[in-house]
Interface confidence: medium
């Protein structure tokens, strides 16, 4: 499977209290079960959501409603394919104090799924 955390590898800087949505792209699998991992521990994420780009290309989401200090860290996504676990490159999520302006740096892809999406 081709596995890609959108915008990775990159450092994301987010204002404390803001929501963040990470997107993970999986190609070459019909029904990927995407797991999200933070600092080596699986993030339990019931009702995980997906968008089908095509039959063999899926986008999975990790939504954080309101990021706090405990959410800072290294995130990646992973899938099991043929008994092997494939992992994406990571994103480093860092925080700035509430009200500060956050600059989130990422690679410049021009598609709807180009980088971790931020929602107000």
């Amino acid at each position: 499977a081709g596995l890609k955390l959108m915008g990775a590898p990159v450092k994301l800087t987010v204002s404390q209290g803001q929501p963040v949505k990470l997107n993970c792209s999986v190609e070459g699998m019909e029904e990927p079960d995407i797991q999200w991992v933070k600092d080596g521990a699986v993030v339990q994420n019931l009702d995980q959501l997906y968008i089908p780009v095509s039959e063999q290309h899926w986008i999975g989401f990790l939504s954080l409603k309101s990021v706090e200090r405990s959410d800072a860290g290294r995130y990646w996504c992973q899938v099991e394919d043929g008994g092997e676990t494939e992992i994406s490159q990571p994103v480093w999520l860092t925080l700035v104090p509430r009200g500060s302006s956050a600059h989130h740096h990422h690679h410049h892809h021009h598609s709807a799924w180009s980088h971790p999406q931020f929602e107000k």
Epitope: D33, Q48, L49
Partner: antibody, heavy 125, light 108 residues
Framework: EVQLVQSGADVKKPGASLTISCQAS????????ISWVRQKPGKGLEWMGA????????YYGPSFQGHVTISADRSTATAYLQWRSLEASDTAMYYC??????????????????WGPGTLVPVSS | SYELTQPPSVSVSPGQTARITCSGD??????AYWYQQKSGQAPVLVIY???KRVSGIPERFSGSSSGTMATLTISGAQVEDEADYYC???????????FGGGTKLTVL
């Protein structure tokens, strides 16, 4: 049209085993999670557990862990809720619910939007 | 285990604003969802992700969330809004769901 068709259940005695089913149609079964929700007579909703899109992961609420088993058969688009040993306190309406899964865009209205009609499980000696 | 707390009942006159609250320690981090259940029927989702109204639900229904409290507001409650309302969210570690105890809304 999304439909969740639930099986019926006869009166069961305490200690009996039981499996109830929820057959999905009108959508691709493996695009969504299925959850189960209990409602005792005259009482509120209780989240029991859920099974992931491809059946590889199950979650259970603390009150239900070890007492029920959630499973699914992708080939028949059917989810199951199973008891090895029923108790009188299991008497309730049980709903299966399509939850999570696919989204058509940035917003996510699919959470718990499609409910089965419920299966009434009476347990009495 | 994690709990969401709702008032057992709320009463308003037709045309008044009804507010139903839901309190839970994880609500600063987890979204709230609101369901309406009329007698003898399966529940219906009205609000998701704290404040987003489901298509087809009247505009008088709105949701908000601040800190550990989520609120369902019905502006100009109608007699047909009489029902039980439940909030739903996830436990803080995200590995199980929880419904609040439910609030019976009476519009008289």
């Amino acid at each position: 049209e999304v439909q969740l068709v639930q099986s019926g259940a006869d009166v069961k005695k305490p200690g009996a085993s039981l499996t109830i089913s929820c057959q999905a149609s009108g959508y691709t079964f493996t695009d969504y999670w299925i959850s189960w929700v209990r409602q005792k007579p005259g009482k509120g909703l209780e989240w029991m557990g859920a099974i992931s899109r491809n059946g590889s992961t199950t979650y259970y609420g603390p009150s239900f862990q070890g007492h029920v088993t959630i499973s699914a058969d992708r080939s028949t688009a059917t989810a199951y809720l199973q008891w090895r040993s029923l108790e009188a306190s299991d008497t309730a309406m049980y709903y299966c619910v399509r939850s999570g899964g696919l989204t058509s865009g940035g917003t996510i209205p699919e959470y718990y939007q499609h409910w089965g009609p419920g299966t009434l499980v009476p347990v009495s000696s | 285990s994690y709990e969401l707390t709702q008032p057992p009942s709320v009463s308003v006159s037709p045309g008044q604003t009804a507010r139903i609250t839901c309190s839970g320690d994880a609500l600063p981090k987890k979204y709230a969802y609101w369901y309406q259940q009329k007698s003898g029927q399966a529940p219906v989702l009205v609000i998701y992700e704290d404040k987003k109204r489901v298509s087809g639900i009247p505009e008088r229904f709105s949701g908000s969330s601040s800190g550990t409290m989520a609120t369902l507001t019905i502006s100009g409650a109608q007699v047909e809004d009489e029902a039980d309302y439940y909030c739903y969210s996830l436990a803080v570690d995200g590995n199980y769901g929880v419904f609040g105890g439910g609030t019976k809304l009476t519009v008289l």
